[in-house]
C-alpha cells in the first residue's frame, strides 16, 4: 500500500560535510516498527546510502559503520548524513516502510538535492 512521504527539496552540507534533513511520512495507521532507507540517485543510478529500523519512540538503528544517524519523533525522522564530499552531491531519497503491524505500507519521497562543496585548503603560513 502507498503512503505519502515529504522531504525538503534542497539542503546544503556544512563545511564538515554533514547534511541534515527531515523525512516526514503520513502514517495511515499506528505503526510500531518503521524502516527508513536513504537512497542516492545520480546519473540515473540509484544506490542505498543507509537503512534503519526503529520502534516508535526509539532512536534509529543504523549499522555501526553507517554514515547516517537519526532520531525519530512521531511521524518525522530527522536524518543526518556525515562524511560527504563534493562528489557525493546528488538527490537523496527517503523511503519509509511501515513494517508492523500489518498491513505493510511503503512510501518514497521526491528526494532532497544535497549540495556538497569541498572546503578550500588553508594556505600555508610561515
Amino acid at each position: 500500500k502507498a503512503m505519502h512521504v515529504a522531504q525538503p527539496a534542497v539542503v546544503l552540507a556544512n563545511s564538515r560535510g554533514t547534511a541534515s534533513f527531515v523525512c516526514e511520512y503520513a502514517s495511515p495507521g499506528k505503526a510500531t516498527e518503521v524502516r527508513v532507507t536513504v537512497l542516492r540517485q545520480a546519473d540515473s543510478q540509484v544506490t542505498e546510502v543507509c537503512a534503519a529500523t526503529y520502534m516508535m519512540g526509539n532512536e534509529l538503528t543504523f549499522l555501526d559503520d553507517s554514515i547516517c544517524t537519526g532520531t525519530s519523533s512521531g511521524n518525522q525522522v530527522n536524518l543526518t548524513i556525515q562524511g560527504l564530499r563534493a562528489m557525493d552531491t546528488g538527490l537523496y531519497i527517503c523511503k519509509v516502510e511501515l513494517m508492523y503491524p500489518p498491513p505493510y505500507y511503503m512510501g518514497i519521497g521526491n528526494g532532497t538535492q544535497i549540495y556538497v562543496i569541498d572546503p578550500e585548503p588553508c594556505p600555508d603560513s610561515d
Epitope: Y54, G57, N58, E59, T61, Y100
Partner: nanobody, 113 residues
Framework: EVQLLESGGGLVQPGGSLRLSCAAS????????MAWYRQAPGKEREVVAG????????NYGDSVKGRFTISRDNSKNTLYLQMNSLRAEDTAVYYC??????WGQGTLVTVSS
C-alpha cells in the same frame, strides 16, 4: 539458524512480579533494536516495550509504563523484561522481537489469584 527463546513465564498472583528472558542466537544481537510484544486471547498483538541497540533508549506501551522495565545484555545476547505490580489484564503470551525481522515462540504469563 536464528533463535529467540523466551523463558520466565508462568502463573503469578495479582501484584506479583516476573522476569522474562529472551536468549538470542544465529544473528548479531547487538545490531538490533529489540522489543517485547504480547497477545492476550482474542486480542491483537501489541507492543509492550522496546529498547535500542545500546540499551540507552527505551520506550513502553501506555498500559505498562511505570510497572515494566526492559533491558538487555549484549555480552550475553539476552533481552529481559522485568514485570512488577502485575494485573489480571497482563495475562498474555509474551513474544521476544528482533525488530523488524525475527520473532520468538512466546512464553505464557498468567496473572490470577
Amino acid at each position: 539458524e536464528v533463535q529467540l527463546l523466551e523463558s520466565g513465564g508462568g502463573l503469578v498472583q495479582p501484584g506479583g512480579s516476573l522476569r522474562l528472558s529472551c536468549a538470542a542466537s544465529g544473528f548479531t544481537f547487538s545490531s538490533y533494536t529489540m522489543a517485547w510484544y504480547r497477545q492476550a486471547p482474542g486480542k491483537e498483538r501489541e507492543v509492550v516495550a522496546g529498547i535500542s541497540r545500546s540499551g540507552g533508549t527505551t520506550n513502553y506501551g501506555d498500559s505498562v509504563k511505570g510497572r515494566f522495565t526492559i533491558s538487555r545484555d549484549n555480552s550475553k545476547n539476552t533481552l529481559y523484561l522485568q514485570m512488577n505490580s502485575l494485573r489480571a489484564e497482563d495475562t498474555a503470551v509474551y513474544y521476544c522481537r528482533a525488530v523488524s525481522d525475527y520473532w520468538g515462540q512466546g512464553t505464557l504469563v498468567t496473572v490470577s489469584s
